[in-house]
Amino acid sequence: YSNFRKSVDSTGRRQYQVQNGPCSYTFLLPETDSCRSSSSPYMSNAVQRDAPLDYDDSVQRLQVLENILENNTQWLMKLENYIQDNMKKEMVEIQQNVVQNQTAVMIEIGTSLLNQTAAQTRKLTDVEAQVLNQTTRLELQLLQHSISTNKLEKQILDQTSEINKLQNKNSFLEQKVLDMEGKHSEQLQSMKEQKDELQVLVSKQSSVIDELEKKLVTATVNNSLLQKQQHDLMETVNSLLTMMSSPNSKSSVAIRKEEQTTFRDCAEIFKSGLTTSGIYTLTFPNSTEEIKAYCDMDVGGGGWTVIQHREDGSVDFQRTWKEYKEGFGSPLGEYWLGNEFVSQLTGQHRYVLKIQLKDWEGNEAHSLYDHFYLAGEESNYRIHLTGLTGTAGKISSISQPGSDFSTKDSDNDKCICKCSQMLSGGWWFDACGPSNLNGQYYPQKQNTNKFNGIKWYYWKGSGYSLKATTMMIRPADF
C-alpha cells in the first residue's frame, strides 16, 4: 500500500512524505534563491497595488518565475522517475515476499495435513490390529467355550449315570434301613421291657437299701448302747465282786438308772457315749416324732447336729416351703434337716451355729455364731444370729437383723422381686443379701460370675459358687 503527504516543517521548508508498505520516504525540496524575503516591498502573496509596476521589471520577473518553474518541473520529473524506479523495486520485493510467505504457509499447511493423514493412517492401522487381535481372542474363547461345553456335557452325562447308580444304591440301602428299623424296633421293645424290669428291680433294691440303712443305723445305735451296757455291767459285776469279797460290806447292789434311748440332738448322743460320726435318729422336743440327722462327732469336740450339707449337686435345693419345713435329701450326702425341727430345738435351749465352707481351690473357712435360733412358722422361720467369729469374713454374710425364710412358693424377702425364684433355693433372703448356701450347685471352672450359685459373699465375693458347705448346731453349754 502507498500514500503521499505534503507538509511544511518547523523551519518553513516544504517536505514530501511517501509511505509504501513498511517503508516511508521523506523528500526535502531545495529553496529558490530568487524568492524574496517577507521584508521585500513586494511579498509573493501581497495584494496588487493600484499603481502599475514598470514593464521591464515585470518581464524580468516573469522570466525568473519561468526559470524557477522549469527547474521545479525538471526536478519533479526526476523525483517522479526516482519514485517510479524505487516503487517498482519495492513492489517486486513486496510481491516476492508475499509469494514467499504464502508458499511457506501453504507448505506448512501441507506438511500439517500430511502429518495428520499419517497419524490417522497409523491410528487406523492400530485399530485394525486391535480388531484383529480381538477377533482372534474371541475366536479362541469361542473355541475354548465349545471345548468346555463338550467337557461339561460329558461330565453331566457321567454324573447322570452316577446319579442313576446312586439312586439304585439308595433304593437298596433304603430297603436295608427298613429291614434294620424293623429289627431295631423289636430290639428296642425288648430293651424297654428289660428297662422296665430293671426299674422295678432298682426300686425294690432301693427300698431294700433304705431298710438296710435303717437297720444299720439301729444296729449302730444298738451296738453303741450294748457296748455301753456291757461296760456298765462289767463295772457292776466288778463292784459286786468287790463288795462280796469285803466282809464288812452290805449286801445291797446299786440299782442303775434307766438307760436313755431317745435324743433331741447329737450333743446328747455324744454325751451318751456314742462318739462316732454318722446318721442318728433324733426325737422332736416334747413329741415322739422322729427325724434322721447326721452327727459330726469329730469337728471341734463333736456333738454337732448337721442341719444343711452341700457337696456335689446331687440333690435339688429349689424346693417348696413344705419340703424346707419337713426336710429333704439324704443325711449321708446332701440334705436339709427341716426348719420345723430346728425351730423347735433352738427355741428351747441356746445353740451355736457353725458354718463350714470349701472353695474350689482347696481352701476352707468357717463362720461361728455364738447364738442362733429360728422363730416359728408363724414368723416364717426368721433367723436370729449374734456373736460372729471365724475365718469366713468379719461381716456376717447372713443379713442382720435376721430375715424371714423364703422359698420358690413363699416369697417373704425384702425385695420387690422374688429372690428365691431368681437366685434359686430356700434361704433367709434380704433383698436379696450376701449369702445363699442353698443355691444352684456349679461344678469347678463353671463356678464364677454366677447369679444363683452357692454364695458366701464375705469370704469369696460375689458370683463365686462354693464347692461344699455344712451348717451345724450344738448347745452353747456343750
Partner: nanobody, 124 residues
Framework: EVQLVESGGGLVQAGGSLRLSCAAS????????LGWFRQAAGKEREGVSC????????YYADSVKGRFTISSDNAKNTVYLQMNSLKPEDTAVYYC?????????????????WGQGTLVTVSS
C-alpha cells in the same frame, strides 16, 4: 458364660472427662440391674451408679451426683458411665457388675457378675 468387659479408662487431668464402656454377654441384658463400682488403693469397693436398679430407674452415689451419668444401649448389650468434672479423688479401678435382682441400693454383694476393671487416674 456370663462376661463383662470394661474399657475407656486412662489418665486424665482434673476437670476433664472420660466415658467408660462395659460390654456384656451371656445373659439377658435388659432383664438385669447393671452397676458401676470403684475401688481405690487400700479402700473398700464402693458403688458409683446403677441402672434398672430401682423399678427401672438409675441411682447415683452422693459423691458423683451431677457429674456422672449412667446409660445403656440394649441393642449393643453395653452400659456406659460418662464421667465429667473429674477430681483426683475419683482415681480408682472402675468395675462393671450385673445383678439378676432389681434393687435400690448399690451393695457390691448384690452383684454376682463382675468385669476385670479399668483403671481411671485423675491427675491434679
Amino acid at each position: 458364660e456370663v462376661q463383662l468387659v470394661e474399657s475407656g479408662g486412662g489418665l486424665v487431668q482434673a476437670g476433664g472427662s472420660l466415658r467408660l464402656s462395659c460390654a456384656a454377654s451371656g445373659f439377658t441384658f435388659d432383664d438385669y440391674a447393671l452397676g458401676w463400682f470403684r475401688q481405690a488403693a487400700g479402700k473398700e469397693r464402693e458403688g458409683v451408679s446403677c441402672i434398672r436398679c430401682s423399678d427401672g430407674s438409675t441411682y447415683y452415689a452422693d459423691s458423683v451426683k451431677g457429674r456422672f451419668t449412667i446409660s445403656s444401649d440394649n441393642a449393643k448389650n453395653t452400659v456406659y458411665l460418662q464421667m465429667n468434672s473429674l477430681k483426683p479423688e475419683d482415681t480408682a479401678v472402675y468395675y462393671c457388675a450385673a445383678s439378676i435382682v432389681p434393687r435400690s441400693k448399690l451393695e457390691p454383694y448384690e452383684y454376682d457378675a463382675w468385669g476385670q476393671g479399668t483403671l481411671v487416674t485423675v491427675s491434679s
